[in-house]
Interface confidence: medium
Amino acid sequence: ESALITQQDLAPQQRAAPQQKRSSPSEGLCPPGHHISEDGRDCISCKYGQDYSTHWNDLLFCLRCTRCDSGEVELSPCTTTRNTVCQCEEGTFREEDSPEMCRKCRTGCPRGMVKVGDCTPWSDIECVHKESGTKHSGEVPAVEETVTSSPGTPASPCSLSG
């Protein structure tokens, strides 16, 4: 896992409540599951289910947990050291080029092509030409051109959020 942080990820700063665990920074950094206090003297724990941090940091805030969108399923909940893992529902997928939404997988390949890859949460079905074996990357074919197939079962998580 890794951590590029964006504006929406930052949780509103809150004063450390009495129940929040504190520890001392190491080399000016706080461990995963914590953020640093404004004066830099303490590491303050993130709040389980609300925010998190994944690496050693000098963040003034923990990062706000992601909420899975409709059309997604939650594979694992947010902890203090790991963000929520969301995955597209069966029959839909998320492309790297358009990570903001899950798109419906095609139901089949155009005529003259064969399916060589199932629908997964991170990729559409894969079609190749029967003769040449070259991949098809066109638009969704018309219904009468399709050979129907059922979506594949997810094999591993497609997490955009840690």
Epitope: L4, Q7, I36, T54, L60, S159
Partner: nanobody, 124 residues
Framework: EVQLLESGGGLVQPGGSLRLSCAAS????????MGWFRQAPGKEREFVSA????????YYADSVKGRFTISRDNSKNTLYLQMNSLRAEDTAVYYC??????????????????WGQGTLVTVS
């Protein structure tokens, strides 16, 4: 479209220092998360460090904690990585990355939207 140009790589002895720079063109970087990843020969690309635009803090991989420092100069549209106490295992191509939009949560190398061409750091 954002262009990222890394510089500062080279050959250095163990225990030495280098400072990498990443100059961004095409837009201001001030509202965007940026970071560094690296890829050693025959290994997967891995996270090194990330910077939040508003001085909210920085992130570091365990392997570089206390040795590397990330910083940015928004007026120069440049991200830096100061690397001290370099080790042989730090040998890799170092890539600068930037988020595509301020709203997009990007937390994996696979999701980082804009990548530089990389600069080679050899510790030997």
């Amino acid at each position: 479209e954002v262009q990222l140009l890394e510089s500062g790589g080279g050959l250095v002895q163990p225990g030495g220092s280098l400072r990498l720079s990443c100059a961004a063109s095409g837009r201001s970087i001030s509202n965007y998360a940026m970071g560094w990843f690296r890829q050693a020969p025959g290994k997967e690309r891995e996270f090194v460090s990330a910077s939040v635009w508003n001085n909210g803090g920085n992130y570091y991989a365990d392997s570089v904690k206390g040795r590397f420092t990330i910083s940015r100069d928004n007026s120069k549209n440049t991200l830096y990585l100061q690397m001290n106490s370099l080790r042989a295992e730090d040998t890799a191509v170092y890539y600068c990355v930037v988020a595509r939009t301020p709203e997009t949560p990007i937390t994996s190398a696979r999701g980082a939207n804009y990548w530089g061409q990389g600069t080679l750091v050899t510790v030997s």
